[in-house]
């Protein structure tokens, strides 16, 4: 007959499971409940995946692993008294008088409920890693945390290699016994202990539950340490960098923590499991019943099979681990779950030229000398596309790519960004906005939707801001409709006339050169270099200024670089930036200073791309530790990450203009990194690659 095999992880749990099985059988509950003995929750998950068991109750972290690695799904959730439905909230609490925010936690003193506890450790640490605030090298989360905070009390961390830092704030009991114990001997243990650590001034931030402050202030706590505490003297840290009142935990928290849930294989009927357990809880959850599902007292333990605080079990409607965990908790788990045993010893970097091979070799040696993990290996390829193929085939792991290549890497090869380059704020040549500039003209004003028949100025054929993005955007928006993939003809027919300088003018529509002027002698008209006065971004703007064209597609800085006295050439010397406007995608016009809100797309920074199964936090963790040593172009550590001058090349491995490698944060897909507008423009162009 049909039966459900529950997986127990210990002898007491097996004992309780046997009793539950008997109780269910005696009550005539179907199907039969059997008990299988596993050695741990992980082992049980493996047994379920291997069809040797069917069900187990797991906490959030284990649900994440079981779902991600083994395809298990949650089907029945626990609900707790005093909690918010099937969840509670992990919050970061600070004293109102302090100036700490989520963005300034580095170096502050921290109070935790205990090592590996959900709200005291897993959520805050996972969140800080996932959001890029805390970098972890080689999966050594403990080291990362001990380096990040300026001392902590993490009860239970006394047996680790980093106890000096992680137990620095712990104080033990009144006689100094049990310092840093993961037990009530340590006065700063558990929710109330971590809050006490903050309240007594030992720490600056406490990672606790949404209800902790309110349960331990305003006269609600019996111990003397809390009797004078007022809830209004504390605030919560919000993820957006703001702070909020302690009652605002629904809006201001680190993550909603999901309740424990029963997980099964994807092919198991979740409804059947709920019906079985529901019948059980109907009969066996009240005081004094011969078997009690939600009590473990009789077995000398806590939380066997189900949490003892469970008030009822409920069916889960959307049976996916992602839906049950919720995106906040899911993201935190992504940041936390890093298995050192699964971490590959090497990160194989893709290199494209002899100079790049040389620089990569030096980088590998420099990293190894500093014991950075994982070690770098250099693997060569013929082209960026070849790199993508080799990464997808698991022959290589990482490569730094430009915007268009990131698009191909993501769309065609399924790669994802692991880290990005960051350039100086004033550096507009590496990450910039593409804008459509027009003369301020109240009598003949037109919008982006009214470009047909206008005269256009472009930096050159194939230039990102001068051609690819504006043409792609106009195709994507349906204004330009190429026939038989002939983009050139379509553009030449869309605009009345243009200047689009080009290197190889064979079969080039004449109207695309109609506005070009060549050099001072009228020669070299429409050539793809500076002999054509309307070539490049400066030239395209000049084409507009001199009234050859009605619109110029340029970078957001082009107007500023050539007005208000910034360019002394005769054509530009008298220009004022306020005489020009931008055309916005929403049909409006805007001041040229409004480029961040009024642009066709932002050209994204380069990014390091990897396979989706690569742990991006270990890649960033490596680069972040490396740039502390080698990121400064003037460092004395024997290698310069962001400089290629020693190798007679430029932009090797990373762009030379890079100031820092940065985490991707929430931009975890190629589309997220590139931005919707840029992707749309590239899709417009790529739709024409027949």
């Amino acid at each position: 007959g049909m039966e459900v095999r529950w997986c127990a992880t210990s002898d007491p749990e097996q004992h309780k499971c046997g009793n539950m099985s008997e109780a269910f059988r005696e009550a005539g509950i179907q199907p039969s409940l059997l008990c299988v003995r596993g050695t741990s929750a992980d082992h049980c998950v493996q047994l379920i995946a291997a069809q040797e068991a069917d069900a187990i109750t797991l906490d959030g972290g284990a649900i994440y692993e079981a779902g991600k690695e083994h395809g298990l799904k949650p089907v029945v959730g626990e609900v707790y008294d005093q909690e918010v439905g099937t969840s509670y909230y992990a919050v970061a609490v600070v004293r109102r008088s302090s100036h700490v925010t989520i963005d300034t936690l580095k170096g502050v003193k921290s109070c935790h409920t205990g090592i590996n506890r959900t709200v005291g450790w897993n959520v805050p640490v996972g969140y800080l890693v996932e959001s890029g605030r805390l970098s972890v090298m080689g999966c050594d989360v403990l080291k990362a945390v001990s380096d990040y905070f300026g001392g902590s009390c993490v009860p239970g961390a006394g047996e680790t290699s980093y106890s000096e830092s992680l137990c620095r704030l712990c104080r033990g009991d009144s006689s100094g016994e049990g310092v840093c114990d993961k037990s009530p001997l340590e006065r700063y243990y558990d929710y109330s202990g971590a809050f006490r650590c903050l309240a007594e001034g030992a720490g600056d931030v406490a990672f606790v539950k949404h209800s902790t402050v309110l349960e331990n202030t305003d006269g609600k706590t019996l111990p003397s340490w809390g009797q004078a505490l007022l809830s209004q003297d504390f605030e919560l840290l919000c993820r957006d960098g703001s702070r909020a009142d302690v009652t605002e935990w629904r809006q201001c928290h680190l993550a909603r923590v999901p309740a424990h849930a029963v997980v099964v294989r994807a092919d198991t009927d979740g409804g059947l499991i709920f019906r079985l357990l529901n019948e059980g809880q109907r009969l066996f959850s009240h005081e004094g019943s011969s078997f009690q599902m939600f009590s473990s007292e009789a077995y000398g333990q806590k939380d066997l099979l189900f949490k003892d605080s469970t008030s009822e079990l409920v069916p889960i409607a959307t049976q996916t681990y992602e839906a049950w965990l919720g995106h906040e908790y899911l993201h935190a788990m992504k940041g936390l779950l890093c298995d050192p045993n699964r971490l590959p010893p090497y990160l194989r970097w893709c290199v494209l030229s002899t100079p790049e091979i040389q620089k990569c070799g030096d980088m590998a040696v420099a990293f190894r000398r500093q014991r950075l993990k994982p070690e770098i290996q250099c693997v060569s390829a013929k082209s960026p596309q070849h790199c993508m193929e080799r990464i997808q085939a698991e022959q290589v792991d990482a490569v730094t790519l430009s915007g268009e290549d990131i698009y191909t890497a993501g769309k065609t090869y399924g790669l994802v960004p692991a880290a990005g380059e960051h350039y100086a704020p004033e550096d507009s040549s590496n990450s910039y906005y593409v804008v459509a500039v027009v003369r301020r003209d109240s009598s003949h004003a037109f919008t982006l939707d009214e470009l047909r028949g206008k005269r256009s100025c472009h930096a050159g054929f194939g230039s990102p801001a001068g051609w690819d993005v504006p043409v792609g955007a106009l195709i994507q928006r349906g204004f330009i409709r190429p026939k038989d993939c002939d983009v050139l003809t379509a553009v030449s027919e869309f605009f009345n006339a243009s200047c689009v300088p080009v290197n190889n003018p064979k079969n080039y529509p004449s109207s695309l050169c109609a506005l070009c002027v060549g050099d001072e002698q009228g020669r070299n008209k429409c050539v793809g270099n500076s002999q054509e006065r309307y070539y490049g971004y400066r030239g395209a703007f000049r084409c507009l200024v001199e009234n050859a064209g009605d619109v110029a597609f340029v970078r957001h800085t082009t107007v500023f670089d050539n007005t208000n006295g910034h360019n002394s050439e005769p054509w530009a010397a008298e220009l004022r930036s306020e005489d020009y406007e931008l055309l916005c995608p929403n049909g409006a016009r805007a001041e040229v200073s409004q480029f961040a809100a009024c642009n066709l797309a932002q050209i994204p920074p380069h990014a390091v791309m990897v396979r989706p199964d690569t742990n991006i936090f270990t890649v960033y963790g490596l680069l972040d530790k490396a740039q502390d040593l080698f990121g400064d172009d003037h460092n004395k550590n024997g290698f310069k990450m962001f400089d290629s001058s020693n190798y007679h090349g430029q932009d090797l491995l990373f762009k030379d203009a890079t100031v820092r490698a940065v985490p991707v944060g929430e931009k975890t897909t190629y589309r997220g990194w590139l931005g919707l507008d840029y992707v749309a423009a590239l899709e417009g162009m790529s739709s024409q690659q027949c």
């Epitope: 005696e26 009969l283 004094g288 019943s289 011969s290």
Partner: antibody
Framework: EVQLQESGPSLVKPSQTLSLTCSVT????????WNWIRKFPGNKLEYMGY???????YYNPSLKSRISITRDTSKNQYYLQLNSVTAEDTATYYC?????????????WGQGTSVTVSS | DFVMTQTPLSLPVSLGDQASISCRAS???????????LHWYLQKPGQSPKLLIY???NRFSGVPDRFSGSGSGTDFTLKISRVEAEDLGVYFC?????????FGGGTKLEIK
């Protein structure tokens, strides 16, 4: 120690209702299963039914249309009613407890009460 | 219902002898959970039945270790290693694997 004691009339007329009480001491009837069993002359034992700690009842299908088991938790008593009795219902009636501790075997029985159905 | 057949009907023994009572079920008593719910009771003269053995071989508290149960599937045995005077009475086997629980016809242990 757990003790169960049956009580009720020893003589019931045919077609009438047999009503018995089981009084429990040393345990609460809100824990476990509380049963009725009868033993016919000639040693044959028949399981009649139970009322559980959560108030759920089970009746032997052979008696289903005639039997009712109820309880009064405030008195720690439970009851048997058997309708439309005939001479075939003449037997010694026992109440007994079943708990998880012995995998729901009947670990404690009452002394039994003898009931004769006769006009 | 599941029929339980006990043999012998009557078992005359001398004090100090070993006694063996057999119980056979009309179908297997192995539950789908792997357990076998076969129990033994003793009813002494003028008393109510008392539990001796539950789930084939587990002695109930206070039951002397001269009582032992064994068997599997459909065939089960109760053994008394050295019969004492207080062991006399009617022995019943009972199954609760299947619903409703049923009893054997009883075996009367008496002095030769």
């Amino acid at each position: 120690e757990v003790q169960l004691q049956e009580s009720g009339p020893s003589l019931v007329k045919p077609s009438q209702t047999l009503s018995l009480t089981c009084s429990v001491t040393g345990d609460s009837i809100t824990s476990g299963y509380w049963n009725w069993i009868r033993k016919f002359p000639g040693n044959k034992l028949e399981y009649m039914g139970y009322i559980s700690d959560s108030g759920i009842t089970y009746y032997n299908p052979s008696l289903k249309s005639r039997i009712s088991i109820t309880r009064d938790t405030s008195k720690n008593q439970y009851y048997l009613q058997l309708n439309s009795v005939t001479a075939e219902d003449t037997a010694t009636y026992y109440c007994a407890r079943r708990t998880l501790a012995t995998y729901y075997a009947m670990d404690y029985w009452g002394q039994g009460t003898s009931v004769t159905v006769s006009s | 219902d599941f029929v339980m057949t006990q043999t012998p009907l009557s078992l005359p023994v001398s004090l100090g002898d070993q006694a063996s009572i057999s119980c056979r079920a009309s179908q297997s008593l192995v539950h789908s959970n792997g357990n076998t719910y076969l129990h033994w009771y003793l009813q002494k003269p003028g008393q109510s039945p008392k539990l001796l053995i539950y789930r084939v071989s587990n002695r109930f508290s206070g039951v002397p270790d001269r009582f032992s149960g064994s068997g599997s599937g459909t065939d089960f045995t109760l053994k008394i290693s050295r019969v004492e005077a207080e062991d006399l009475g009617v022995y019943f086997c009972s199954q609760s694997t299947h619903v409703p629980p049923t009893f054997g016809g009883g075996t009367k242990l008496e002095i030769k």
